[in-house]
């Protein structure tokens, strides 16, 4: 069966937007009218993993482009990077560890833990135009809180 | 240090069923990001990737295999299993595990290999 | 399947000789390479991780190089242990795949 993906749009628990910068880096800052068309979309797709009631294992994709989160270990460190990948493989049921995350529900706020990395989560800075990063820390200075906006295909 | 070391191999008839056992030392397969995998290798040919198995129960497997193999893993006595079933002329190899640590990867401890021939 | 060939199949070389080994991906696989090196009825053992990161205990006379879909392993000078074969694997996309091996032999 093929891999069940749904579009959406990712805020911050304190409503930054995520948007490209360069080709291969997503940073987060506040948008408003035109602008929020900036903002990135992504392709959520539901892959195989260990599953519950409020965790979930997916893969985020940007819409229509051929790059995908990932965790991988850079100078001993996990690191998040957008990876391209061959359009014609993927999405699929069966991702690579390093693409899967963990989608965590919890008080209406949604949590992104890597599959890889336990413990480290997609996460934004306090300050306005900075990089998305994979953080080790939940609670502290740095947001692991998003928000979820469904888009229509 | 870390050791693995392979057992189970042997002579089968077609159609029949091994299962291929590798025992570590030095390392847990509870530790987030630790992997093993099976590699096999025909005699007098390359290395093929067969199946792997991460700390957390994930399993991933080469598709040639067909769904005959299943890997398994019993943490507590720091083993990884291979059971192997419809067993073909073509499965005949030495099958090595080997561990690695997180995505993408690469295998930094090997065992030895067992021998597995299938053959009537 | 991401398909890897190695070249050469063969290489006959001298002790002291800088060697070259090329692997080949048939799609883009990033710095996701590694390479192997094994000796006839022994396991093999990883020389170089990340494209070219020297896996610890490794001489510094292997090196590797490359990135997207070619790849190349460099012994500056051949030592008489380095006759052996060396396999390349890609790790970017299931099922991981090695290239078929080279076989460095003494001239």
């Known amino acids: 069966a093929p891999v069940r993906s749904l579009n959406c749009t990712l805020r911050d628990s304190q409503q930054k937007s995520l948007v490209m910068s360069g080709p291969y880096e997503l940073k987060a800052l506040h948008l408003q009218g035109q602008d929020m068309e900036q903002q990135v979309v992504f392709s959520m797709s539901f892959v195989q993993g260990e599953e519950s009631n409020d965790k979930i294992p997916v893969a985020l994709g940007l819409k229509e482009k051929n790059l995908y989160l990932s965790c991988v270990l850079k100078d001993d460190k996990p690191t998040l990077q957008l990876e391209s990948v061959d359009p014609k493989n993927y999405p699929k049921k069966k991702m690579e560890k390093r693409f899967v995350f963990n989608k965590i529900e919890i008080n209406n706020k949604l949590e992104f833990e890597s599959a890889q990395f336990p413990n480290w989560y997609i996460s934004t800075s306090q300050a306005e135009n900075m990089p998305v990063f994979l953080g080790g820390t939940k609670g502290g200075q740095d947001i692991t809180d998003f928000t979820m906006q469904f888009v229509s295909s | 240090e870390v050791q693995l070391v392979e057992s189970g191999g042997g002579s089968v008839q077609p159609g029949g069923s091994l299962r291929l056992s590798c025992a570590f030392s030095?390392?847990?397969?509870?530790?987030?990001?630790?992997?093993v995998g099976w590699i096999r290798q025909a005699p007098g040919k390359g290395l093929e990737w067969v199946s792997h198995?991460?700390?957390?129960?994930?399993?991933s497997y080469n598709p040639s295999l067909k769904g005959r193999f299943t890997i398994s893993k019993d943490t507590s006595r720091n083993t990884v299993y291979l059971q192997m079933n419809s067993l073909r002329a073509e499965d005949t190899a030495s099958y090595f595990c080997?561990?690695?640590?997180?995505?993408?990867?690469?295998?930094?401890?090997w065992g030895q290999g067992t021998t597995v021939t299938v053959s009537s | 399947d991401i398909q890897m060939t190695q070249s050469p199949s063969t290489l006959s070389a001298s002790v002291g000789d800088r060697v070259t080994i090329t692997c080949r991906a048939s799609?883009?696989?990033?710095?996701?390479l590694s390479w192997y090196q094994q000796k006839p009825g022994k396991a093999p053992k990883l020389l170089i991780y990340?494209?070219?990161k020297l896996h610890s205990g490794v001489p510094s006379r292997f090196s590797g190089s490359g990135s997207g879909a070619e790849f190349t392993l460099t012994i500056s000078s051949l030592q008489p242990e380095d006759f052996a074969t060396y396999f390349c694997?890609?790790?970017?996309?299931?099922?991981?795949?090695f290239g078929q091996g080279t076989k460095l032999e003494i001239k």
């Open positions: 030095g390392f847990s397969l509870s530790t987030s990001g630790m992997g």
């Open positions: 080997a561990r690695n640590r997180y995505d993408p990867p690469w295998f930094v401890d």
């Open positions: 990340y494209t070219s």
């Open positions: 694997l890609q790790g970017k996309m299931l099922p991981w795949t």
């Open positions: 799609q883009d696989i990033s710095n996701y």
């Open positions: 198995i991460w700390w957390d129960g994930d399993e």
